[in-house]
Interface confidence: low
């Protein structure tokens, strides 16, 4: 199963790697900065979008947030709404689409460099710094694109999802990134948590496949936050 190259989804959503409140470290998709592979309502259109009732952001898809559908509406009636794209207004990070965060009321790009110090600090705090490197190599991965003569198979090292074979995405595994399978219906997925709330995800899963979104299992609605399982479900 650890590199510190950050993907844009992970910047927005930093789940607890060590059993924090969320208990869902690691899904999302590994991508090169600026390249997004979101799940959620990626394949939805306004025409087929079915409102999904929710109580909190974590019950919605990756590209959604939980809010009242009308401004100043009844707080008791909340549904999953499509995330806000870059330069759109926002009130909190969760409202912004993967790869963005809420700054001064506007969704702005999560430039990897802006977060590097914060993230490395989080890594050390949450996972411990008892690993070592050999031969003076840096911990940061420096994969060269010339490595990739053929598409990576499951478990092989990658830099971005395009380095992986069809049906696989590039996702974090400890400090490395490896090709992992895109998730199918019923498979466990990870609900993204919000920037700054928890530690960096040590593991990631791929996103749910086409026509699927990562949602809380119906029979887990009553469970505590820490034990909730999310699975890939049909829209």
């Amino acid at each position: 199963t650890l590199n510190s190259v950050l993907n844009s989804n992970a910047i927005k959503n930093l789940p607890p790697p060590l059993g924090g409140a969320a208990g869902h470290p690691g899904s999302a998709v590994s991508a090169a900065p600026g390249i997004l592979y979101p799940g959620g309502n990626k394949y939805q259109t306004i025409d087929n979008y079915q409102p999904y009732p929710c109580a909190e952001d974590e019950e919605c898809g990756t590209d959604e947030y939980c809010a009242s559908p009308t401004r100043g509406g009844d707080a008791g009636v909340q549904i999953c709404l499509a995330c806000r794209k870059r330069r759109k207004r926002c009130m909190r990070h969760a409202m912004c689409c993967p790869g963005n965060y809420c700054k001064n009321g506007i969704c702005v790009s999560s430039d990897q460099n802006n977060f590097r110090g914060e993230i490395e600090e989080t890594i050390t705090e949450s996972f411990g710094n008892d690993h070592s490197t050999l031969d003076g190599y840096s911990r940061r991965t420096t994969l060269s694109s010339k490595m990739y003569h053929s598409k990576g198979q499951e478990g092989s090292v990658c830099l971005r999802s395009s380095d992986c074979a069809t049906g696989l995405c590039c996702a974090r595994h400890f400090w490395s990134k490896i090709c992992k399978p895109v998730l199918k219906e019923g498979q466990v997925c990870t609900k993204h948590r919000r920037k700054g709330s928890h530690g960096l995800e040590i593991f990631q899963r791929c996103y749910c496949g086409e026509g699927l979104s990562c949602r809380i299992q119906k029979d887990h609605h009553q469970a505590s936050n820490s034990s909730r399982l999310h699975t890939c479900q049909r829209h």
Partner: antibody, heavy 118, light 112 residues
Framework: QVQLVESGGGLVQPGGSLRLSCAAS????????MSWVRQAPGKGLEWVSS??????????WYAAGVKGRFTISRDNSKNTLYLQMNSLRAEDTAVYYC?????????WGQGTLVTVSS | DIALTQPASVSGSPGQSITISCTGT?????????VSWYQQHPGKAPKLMIY???NRPSGVSNRFSGSKSGNTASLTISGLQAEDEADYYC???????????FGGGTKLTVLG
């Protein structure tokens, strides 16, 4: 197909040293994490150590009980994984498995027995 | 130290279903939805049967399935067959010095 073959096990006295080797074939060795997992006679599996691929800086990880005594390394040109074991103790007696750490330990060797006894 | 707790043994008759539990803490199994299960026949190397809680590697029978709730993961084997008799180990990740943790193993006996 993926093959992992361990060697180098044997009988050694407490305080002694051994170097285990694992010859890999059937996959791009340099692109995968590799690990050692051991199993004491009649006991369960215990993770020992892991090493990343070159491009992640050959980062190494060790279980608390072996840290400072064992050293994992790899030679990608020879498709070989190593475990240098120093200051061996009776409790290190086990079958040592070399495992490819793709998505978890997806391929294992057949193991090599290390016996530490006076 | 065994980080994850499994029953020492379970048994079932051919055709039946059995479930093996694996219990950890919020620092290991409960903190990661990354649980794997391995099958080990006597004198043989372990074989990966389930990864990421409920995913089967290619070549593994769909009679094997996994699940997880809170700090406990489960492996269910349906339509039990004689060749399923083996030791089964769960594995997860953990904080602290030990990054990878295994359960103590469960011996599955297929009766009859």
């Amino acid at each position: 197909q993926v093959q992992l073959v361990e060697s180098g096990g044997g009988l050694v006295q407490p305080g002694g040293s051994l170097r285990l080797s694992c010859a890999a074939s059937g996959f791009t060795f340099s692109s995968y994490w590799m690990s050692w997992v051991r199993q004491a006679p009649g006991k369960g599996l215990e993770w020992v150590s892991s090493i990343e691929h070159k491009d992640a800086g050959y980062t190494t990880w060790y279980a608390a009980g072996v840290k400072g005594r064992f050293t994992i390394s790899r030679d990608n040109s020879k498709n070989t994984l190593y475990l240098q074991m120093n200051s061996l103790r009776a409790e290190d007696t086990a079958v040592y498995y070399c495992a490819r750490h793709g998505i978890d330990f997806d391929h294992w060797g057949q193991g090599t027995l290390v016996t530490v006894s006076s | 130290d065994i980080a994850l707790t499994q029953p020492a043994s379970v048994s079932g008759s051919p055709g039946q279903s059995i479930t093996i539990s694996c219990t950890g803490t919020s620092s290991d199994l409960g903190g990661y939805n990354y649980v794997s299960w391995y099958q080990q026949h006597p004198g043989k190397a372990p074989k990966l049967m389930i990864y990421d809680v409920n995913n089967r590697p290619s070549g593994v029978s769909n009679r094997f399935s996994g699940s997880k709730s809170g700090n406990t993961a489960s492996l269910t084997i349906s339509g039990l067959q004689a060749e399923d008799e083996a030791d089964y180990y769960c594995q997860s990740y953990a904080s602290g010095n030990t990054k990878v943790v295994f359960g103590g193993g469960t011996k599955l006996t297929v009766l009859g």
